[in-house]
């Protein structure tokens, strides 16, 4: 029983599971979208694929008061090795280019699906 107890206790979530859950959350957001997501807020676009999780979080963390993406923000923070706070700006962003949150979420979903297919879980 002592040994079996170890299986029941929650351990770290495997990266593949975490990525699948993030994809599921983004699918949820894109499918359930009725009014403009986050009142049509704009976020910085990203121009590279490396370090994408932190860059994506840096973009989305600047959207406040939007409950629809709060779970996504929390999930992305689990993929980013450093603490991200509002106002941070990564070299991965296209400084002059902002896009709508809804489009950003849709694009992020596309990219994460590709990573999942390719087995890139981190």
């Amino acid at each position: 029983l002592t040994c079996l107890g170890g299986f029941a206790s929650p351990g770290p979530v495997p990266p593949s599971t975490a990525l699948r859950e993030l994809i599921e959350e983004l699918v949820n957001i894109t499918q359930n979208q009725k009014a403009p997501l986050c009142n049509g807020s704009m976020v910085w676009s990203i121009n590279l694929t490396a370090g994408m999780y932190c860059a994506a979080l840096e973009s989305l963390i600047n959207v406040s008061g939007c409950s629809a993406i709060e779970k996504t923000q929390r999930m992305l923070s689990g993929f980013c090795p450093h603490k991200v706070s509002a106002g941070q700006f990564s070299s991965l962003h296209v400084r002059d280019t902002k896009i709508e949150v809804a489009q950003f979420v849709k694009d992020l979903l596309l990219h994460l699906k590709k990573l999942f297919r390719e087995g890139q879980f981190n």
Partner: nanobody, 118 residues
Framework: GVQLLESGGGLVQPGGSLRLSCAAS????????MGWARQAPGKGLEWVSS????????YYADSVKGRFTISRDNSKNTLYLEMNSLRAEDTAVYYC???????????WGQGTLVTVSS
């Protein structure tokens, strides 16, 4: 919203060269596979070339292989098509487009006309 704006078309003599550009905005260009298609007068749409999101893998139609080169600059949100040794049969409207398998990610530009004639 999403915009794909082609430029660089024009009139060129057979054997000449042109470089088409496609400026993308309103979406995360760096995460999309992209491509070029063309439509010759009175003909159907032909897929010419595509490139993956990172720019490492490319595809070319047999009709342009060895003459056309596709490339991209993700830092500039721009897709390119370098066209050399142009022939009369390359005359067409060239369209920049996303090249994703899921058609909810299907975006097209308005096109730019390339005319190869002496």
């Amino acid at each position: 919203g999403v915009q794909l704006l082609e430029s660089g078309g024009g009139l060129v003599q057979p054997g000449g060269s042109l470089r088409l550009s496609c400026a993308a905005s309103g979406f995360t260009f760096a995460w999309y596979d992209m491509g070029w298609a063309r439509q010759a007068p009175g003909k159907g749409l032909e897929w010419v070339s595509s490139i993956d999101d990172s720019g490492t893998q490319t595809y070319y139609a047999d009709s342009v292989k060895g003459r056309f080169t596709i490339s991209r600059d993700n830092s500039k949100n721009t897709l390119y098509l370098e066209m050399n040794s142009l022939r009369a049969e390359d005359t067409a409207v060239y369209y920049c487009a996303t090249a994703e398998r899921d058609d909810t990610y299907d975006y097209w530009g308005q096109g730019t006309l390339v005319t190869v004639s002496s």
